[in-house]
Interface confidence: low
């Protein structure tokens, strides 16, 4: 009787694990073994696939084969007993394109109202993801063990902290990886659970904000108690993607060590152009708080999203406002290379009733004004793009009187 070759062959690749599965064509024939060959693109000869020769089951592992994962390969399988079946060729495939991302490794640390999550790829020093290790992002699902109500958090990096949790409460979570540059979404890790600690005596500082004054950054925050000292640390944001990097160390801002107020001022030249994370910690001499939530701080946006400058041309029933680029020290205009939207607030000098105009254009008409009346105007800029999401402070108010009643043209 002629042996039939297996017809349905599946290739599963998870990280660096290459698994083949197939169906027996003829269940009635016993003691059949199976063997695979492979062929690289552009080659004529077939090579025996190590790990997949004379297999008695319907599954084999060829992970030991050192393939170029970006190169297309072809497989063929046959059944063997006394004689052999014809070869069945599997559709050619590129391992990298076919590969799925396996479950990541997850390590948790508990604070009173936060959990720190350390995530690393499931396969250490993976060949498959060697060029993409820093491109992994992760998403997770977290729930209180007692309730089971799930919350999803997308787009997190290798080291992530979840805030606003309850003390002395068990939380469970699972994590999966994504490789957005190749549009791959992985499988979830096993579930990990951890209990948050007893509530700390000192809460962390809150509502951290950075603004620019003259050539300095001003960092402000809120705190519940008086007579405290604070320290501020910074980290390059890109290191969040690569916490294994030896540079992953939070550093002190020299002018913000052991400050007694809820703000500190430091020169702009402390930071080169880039994106940083900042965090603040409080101490009363005996106890220290946990670190505050980290804020993202982009020197380009922070430094250059200055309030707009504007000129007013006064008519009897309106103002024409011409918005120009803000000035740096030295009176040179700042180049804003991202789109802005302008918020213009105006009010009658004798009244507190403010009106607002939002406008993308740099020439704006403020309508419906009364003649011979003093109105004041202030403006600020917002970035239009949600990924930047910044606002300047308001400009100083400029007050002008409208013209008499016949000058509206």
């Amino acid at each position: 009787k002629n042996l039939k070759s297996p017809q349905k062959v599946e290739v599963d690749i998870i990280d660096d694990n290459f698994i083949l599965r197939w169906n027996r064509s003829d269940e009635s024939v016993g003691n059949v073994t199976f063997s695979f060959d492979y062929q690289k693109t552009g080659m004529d000869n077939w090579i025996k696939l190590s790990g997949c020769q004379n297999i008695t089951s319907t599954k084999c592992n060829f992970s030991s084969l050192k393939l170029n994962v970006y190169e297309e390969i072809k497989l063929r399988i046959r059944a063997e007993k006394e004689n052999t079946s014809s070869w069945y060729e599997v559709d050619s495939f590129t391992p990298f394109r076919k590969a799925q991302i396996g479950p990541p490794e997850v390590h948790l640390e508990a604070e009173d109202k936060a959990i720190v999550i350390h995530i690393s790829p499931g396969t250490k020093d993976s060949v498959m993801w060697a060029l993409d290790g820093l491109s992994f992002t992760y998403s997770l699902v977290i729930w209180k063990n007692s309730s089971g109500v799930e919350e999803r958090i997308e787009n997190i990096y290798s080291r992530h902290k979840i805030y606003k949790l309850s003390p002395e409460t068990t939380y469970c979570l699972k994590v999966k990886a994504a490789l957005l540059t190749s549009w791959k979404i992985g499988v979830y890790s096993p579930v990990h659970c951890i209990k948050t600690t007893v509530e700390n005596e000192l809460p962390p500082p809150e509502n951290i904000e950075v603004s620019v004054q003259n050539q300095n950054y001003v960092l402000k925050w809120d705190y519940t108690y008086a007579n405290m000292t604070f320290q501020v640390q910074w980290l390059h944001a890109f290191l969040k993607r690569n916490p294994g990097n030896h540079l992953y160390k939070w550093k002190q801002i020299p002018d913000c060590e052991n400050v007694k107020t809820t703000q500190c001022v430091f020169p702009q030249n402390v930071f080169q152009k880039g994106i940083y994370l900042l965090r603040v910690q409080a101490s009363d001499g005996n106890n220290t708080s946990f670190w505050s939530e980290e804020i993202k701080f982009d020197t380009e946006i922070q430094a250059f999203l200055l309030p707009p400058v504007f000129n007013i041309r006064s008519l009897s029933d309106s103002f024409h406002i011409y918005i120009g680029a803000p000035k740096q020290s030295g009176n040179t205009p700042v180049i804003q290379d991202y789109p802005l939207i302008y918020e213009i607030i105006f009010w009658e000098n004798t009244s507190n009733a403010e009106r607002k105009i939002i406008e993308k254009k740099t020439d704006v008409t403020v309508p419906n004004l009364k003649p011979l009346t003093v109105y004041c105007v202030k403006a600020r800029a917002h970035t239009m793009d949600e990924k930047l999401n910044k606002s300047s402070v308001f400009s100083d108010a400029v007050c002008e009187k409208t013209k008499p009643g016949n000058t509206s043209k």
């Epitope: 820093l134 992002t137 997308e154 787009n155 990096y157 994504a178 957005l180 540059t181 549009w183 944001a237 890109f238 969040k240 993607r241 994106i275 993202k296 789109p339 239009m384 793009d385 949600e386 990924k387």
Partner: nanobody
Framework: QVQLQESGGGLVQAGGSLRLSCAAS????????MGWYRQAPGKEREFVAT???????NYADSVKGRFTISRDNAKNTVYLQMNSLKPEDTAVYYC????????????????WGQGTQVTVSS
């Protein structure tokens, strides 16, 4: 906030065709990549097809040769032409868009649509 609006789902006989479309709005940025995933009842969401900024396409093996993804960059819209539909293609189809500044690593973001139901009857 980015909104993704899918349309084109519905009920179709096996062997028939449907064309899904998904328009991204709500930001002046262009999506770096757009694509389709699907979720059948009781199963995980699975990849169907994607197209990136350089118009490189990727397809799941199960839809290769039957489905074609394309995009209109001017309209921030992605399309999925589904031919030779099979009952196993029945699922909720989700549009996805990646907004990514590949130079600034913290600006990756993936957004999902609400989904559109595709039912293929035998």
């Amino acid at each position: 906030q980015v909104q993704l609006q899918e349309s084109g789902g519905g009920l179709v006989q096996a062997g028939g065709s449907l064309r899904l479309s998904c328009a991204a709005s709500g930001t002046i940025s262009k999506p770096w990549g757009m694509g389709w995933y699907r979720q059948a009842p009781g199963k995980e969401r699975e990849f169907v097809a994607t197209i990136d900024g350089g118009s490189t396409t990727n397809y799941a093996d199960s839809v290769k040769g039957r489905f074609t993804i394309s995009r209109d960059n001017a309209k921030n819209t992605v399309y999925l032409q589904m031919n030779s539909l099979k009952p196993e293609d029945t699922a909720v189809y989700y549009c996805a868009a990646v907004y990514a500044d590949l130079d600034v690593v913290l600006y990756y973001h993936i957004y999902w649509g609400q989904g559109t139901q595709v039912t293929v009857s035998s």
